[in-house]
């Protein structure tokens, strides 16, 4: 598989790695989201590990207000992070795509 | 970096790998998009390599109708593919996240 295809596969599998732990196996509850962010996106969270910070992230992602994050909401979130990364990328004129 | 962070990095770097080839270096024109899809997402395109198919994809992605695909439109597109992959994933009850 090409790197971009693998990237999409990682996005899907990471969601299900955590969504299946409690309750609705196709949605992330707050505990599952917290674990996903802490383990899989530590650079996004940084030092914001207090409860209120997680509640805010959860609230911002939960567009249908059901106290859970479904796959579509998760994709919107990752798109936002990618767009933030892209803004940084575009701000560095000579930046080459990072080699793996 | 964690796999999900690397996945986001691949999404950004893949876009710029092609967007910088012609014209606006922060947008994909039709030629660049065609090359990106053919080389980086062959499983998405499958056998649909005719001109009309590309025009259709381009039209669907180009939400602001400027005949180019910016990073946000590209993210929406990838989210749609991820959601299609996820529907397949959810349709297979015993499917484990694919190991890399």
């Amino acid at each position: 598989a090409r790197p971009l295809e693998e990237a999409l596969d990682v996005i899907v599998s990471t969601f299900h790695k955590y969504s299946g732990k409690e309750g609705d196996k196709f949605k992330l509850n707050k505990t599952e989201l917290k674990e996903l962010l802490t383990r899989e996106l530590p650079s996004f969270l940084g030092k914001r590990t207090d409860e209120a910070a997680f509640q805010k992230v959860m609230s911002n992602l939960d567009s249908n207000r059901d106290n859970e994050v479904d796959f579509q909401e998760y994709c919107v979130f990752l798109s936002c992070i990618a767009m933030m990364c892209n803004e940084f990328f575009e701000g560095c004129p000579d930046k080459e795509p990072r080699k793996k | 970096a964690r796999p999900l962070e690397e996945a986001l990095d691949v999404i950004v770097s893949t876009f710029h790998k092609y967007s910088g080839k012609e014209g606006d270096k922060f947008k994909l024109n039709k030629t660049e998009l065609k090359e990106l899809l053919t080389r980086e997402l062959p499983s998405f395109l499958g056998k649909r390599t005719d001109e009309a198919a590309f025009q259709k994809v381009m039209s669907n992605l180009d939400s602001n109708r400027d005949n180019e695909v910016d990073f946000q439109e590209y993210c929406v597109f990838l989210s749609c593919i991820a959601m299609m992959c996820n529907e397949f994933f959810e349709g297979c009850p015993d499917k484990e996240p694919r190991k890399k």
Epitope: G23, K30, A52, Q55, K56, S59, N60, S63, R65, N67 | -
Partner: antibody, heavy 120, light 107 residues
């Protein structure tokens, strides 16, 4: 201390559009909260109307969706409600509220309410 | 929509009494249940959220319990300022819905 203040006409004619604005003070009108409209009928029953929040995301009560429009103006710390084709059944006290980001998204701050009467 | 049914619709009690109000949801609301107090001519005030968590500034005589579809608000020792109407509200899904209210009056 967060304060919410509703404003708008107290009397609206049947078939016209009810327009209300809520001004938020004492707190920045941030993305961390959803901003709601709730109404209380003369019989004291409460009905959630809808809200606007993160990224301009809007959710409406399906029972009112066809007549409802909500918007916000972050520069003025305001959000507003428009309810079209009103009838006497829309007579109520209208409250604007802030929806907290805590579990269950409770309404932690309320305006004092404004009575809207629909009558010719 | 999730229907919320409160009981009783009114009750009479004396200062110092223990008062219990119940709220039943038409389906499991996973503890996403909030309680409010309203005094005549005033807006509602949040008391408890997520079944049992006390909102800031609310006296500890107010407590909540329950799970699934059945929830309870308890006032351990009724005070003069507690005579009011109490509403439950589900925060589980949209549209948000409220109970019909319980009016607590002086006996």
């Amino acid at each position: 201390q967060v304060q919410l203040q509703e404003s708008g006409p107290g009397l609206v004619k049947p078939s016209q559009t009810l327009s209300l604005t809520c001004t938020v003070s004492g707190d920045s009108f941030t993305n961390d909260y959803y901003w709601n409209w709730i109404r209380q009928f003369p019989g004291k029953g409460l009905e959630w109307i809808g809200h606007i929040g993160y990224g301009g995301n809007i959710n409406y009560n399906p029972s009112l969706k066809n007549r409802l429009s909500m918007s916000r103006d972050t520069s003025k710390n305001q959000f507003s409600l428009k309810l079209s084709s009103v009838t006497a059944a829309d007579t109520a006290v209208y409250y604007c509220t802030r929806e907290s980001f805590y579990d269950g998204y409770p309404f932690d701050y309320w305006g004092q309410g404004t009575l809207v009467t629909v009558s010719s | 929509d999730i229907q919320m049914t409160q009981s009783p619709s009114s009750l009479s009690a004396s200062v110092g009494d223990r008062v219990t109000i119940t709220c039943r949801a038409s389906q499991d609301i996973r503890n996403y249940l909030n309680w409010y107090q309203q005094k005549p001519g005033k807006a509602l005030k949040l008391l408890l959220y997520y079944t049992s968590r006390l909102h800031s500034g609310v006296p500890s005589r107010f407590s909540g319990s329950g799970s699934g579809t059945d929830y309870t608000l308890t006032i351990s020792s009724l005070q003069p300022e507690d005579f009011a109407t109490y509403y439950c509200q589900q925060g589980n899904s949209l549209p948000r819905t409220f109970g019909g209210g319980t009016k607590v009056e002086i006996k």
